[in-house]
Amino acid sequence: QVKPCDFPDIKHGGLFHENMRRPYFPVAVGKYYSYYCDEHFETPSGSYWDYIHCTQNGWSPAVPCLRKCYFPYLENGYNQNYGRKFVQGNSTEVACHPGYGLPKAQTTVTCTEKGWSPTPRCIRVRTCSKSDIEIENGFISESSSIYILNKEIQYKCKPGYATADGNSSGSITCLQNGWSAQPICINSSEKCGPPPPISNGDTTSFLLKVYVPQSRVEYQCQPYYELQGSNYVTCSNGEWSEPPRCIHPCIITEENMNKNNIKLKGRSDRKYYAKTGDTIEFMCKLGYNANTSILSFQAVCREGIVEYPRCE
């Protein structure tokens, strides 16, 4: 059983002799009727009228009336499309003079049921000037002096120089507030590789392959190790500044205390970690007497070494 077609709802148009025909609906597949389109609309064949067919899948064409959009005259733009007709669904590029463009940096307009979207017009847009670019040890080969918003330009570094990420060329982009960055061409010999490793410590960030001068990297020591020196290194003239040292802690073990018949004063730790410079207070175990000087019971940790007092 083939589904018949109900009365067609033709947006922006209608059937000829609509009121006479309405009582005879729904109609069988195969029937066709003449219809018209309103002003500013046309049939898919480009006429103001055509036939609409009842098919197994409903009315054909599905969109009987399509919007016509005529391309307007562009102030501050190239007018190769001026007066040309576009149909609903068609898009076209808008070519504006340098320094002008569509709003929101768009480049195309589309003919929609309601007309052009966005409206084809060329407004003053943000531009960047070549004269605002300072490039040392490199060059820009592009000939323009003014660049529109979002325009990317390439620059090249002279032999022996490279961009921050080690390449021989780079790019900058014209943004709302000017150029995205100034071109950087650094003497390859001034850059640094990854900073050096240190014993019992590590860097706090993901290390890169190449660092530009004045880059800083932070180090940290393993737990209980003490950082000596600056916790940052800086890249300068192709070399890193002196990295810090991680000084061994003193590990006070129950084994060593038992050997000397001593215990920690005021603590019951079986294992105790002390940093360089820390004072560790000991006392004799019950029933034992000091065999070393009273000062030795206030031992000082020196780079992992501690001298234990002794009790007999």
Epitope: G166, N167, P194, P195, P197, K209
Partner: antibody, heavy 121, light 106 residues
Framework: QVQLQESGPGLVKPSGTLSLTCAVS?????????WSWVRQSPGKGLEWIGE???????NKKPSLKSRVIISVDKSKNQFSLKLISVNAADTAIYYC??????????????WGQGTMVTVSS | EIVMTQSPATLSVSPGERATLSCRAS??????LAWYQQKPGQAPRLLIY???TRATGIPVRFSGSGSGTQFTLTISSLQSEDFAVYYC????????FGQGTRLEIK
């Protein structure tokens, strides 16, 4: 053309140390590249373990850092991985890889063929 | 740690058709993203680096796009040798891989 070849024991006991070496041929380990270790558990995805530069600088996966030792031997043109206190979850194919020449950080363009390591008693 | 999420987990496509694989980063990785292809019993192979640059010897049917957190690998017309597992990897901050997308014959 640089080639990488992993070698090491295929079986390691639980709580033991997994030791692997990656031999670099057709190029120098002292080039401007990071030399990495990546593993793939059976039927699973890829996991980056860590990497070393010829100067001895390393990057390691934070969650594995305490168990991972990566070293480089420039005289033998090779780098090594030690993974301590292993358990069954460390059973995987272990790959060594090299990152691309170029920028500050790059993708892996050369891989070894991988070596299967099983952790079992 | 930056988490990379690939979708779909499995993609079934007929030879000659287009395949689109997605990869999302939990935070911006700029353009520091690579795509790898892995076939059973083989090591991964680099296809795309810098989000959109084809590696040496990779056919033009492979293309990458995106930046920041959203990336796409497109294979314009699938050949029989393209059916494999594909991984994305960020190398902006440490290095992490996505869980992979299996591309299978429909």
């Amino acid at each position: 053309q640089v080639q990488l070849q992993e070698s090491g024991p295929g079986l390691v006991k639980p709580s033991g140390t997994l030791s692997l070496t990656c031999a670099v041929s057709g190029g120098s380990i002292s080039s401007s590249n990071w030399w990495s270790w990546v593993r793939q558990s059976p039927g699973k995805g890829l996991e980056w373990i860590g990497e070393i530069y010829h100067t001895g600088s390393t990057n390691k996966k934070p969650s594995l850092k305490s168990r991972v030792i990566i070293s480089v031997d420039k005289s033998k043109n090779q780098f090594s991985l030690k993974l301590i206190s292993v358990n069954a979850a460390d059973t995987a194919i272990y790959y060594c890889a090299r990152d691309r020449e170029g920028g500050t950080t790059e993708a892996f363009d050369i891989w070894g063929q991988g070596t299967m390591v099983t952790v079992s008693s | 740690e930056i988490v990379m999420t690939q979708s779909p987990a499995t993609l079934s496509v007929s030879p000659g058709e287009r395949a689109t694989l997605s990869c999302r980063a939990s935070q911006s990785v700029s353009s520091n993203l690579a795509w790898y292809q892995q076939k059973p019993g083989q090591a991964p192979r680099l296809l795309i680096y810098g989000a959109s640059t084809r590696a040496t010897g990779i056919p033009v049917r492979f293309s990458g796009s995106g930046s920041g957190t959203q990336f796409t690998l497109t294979i314009s017309s699938l050949q029989s040798e393209d059916f494999a597992v594909y991984y994305c990897q960020q190398y902006d901050n440490w290095r992490t891989f996505g869980q992979g997308t299996r591309l299978e014959i429909k």
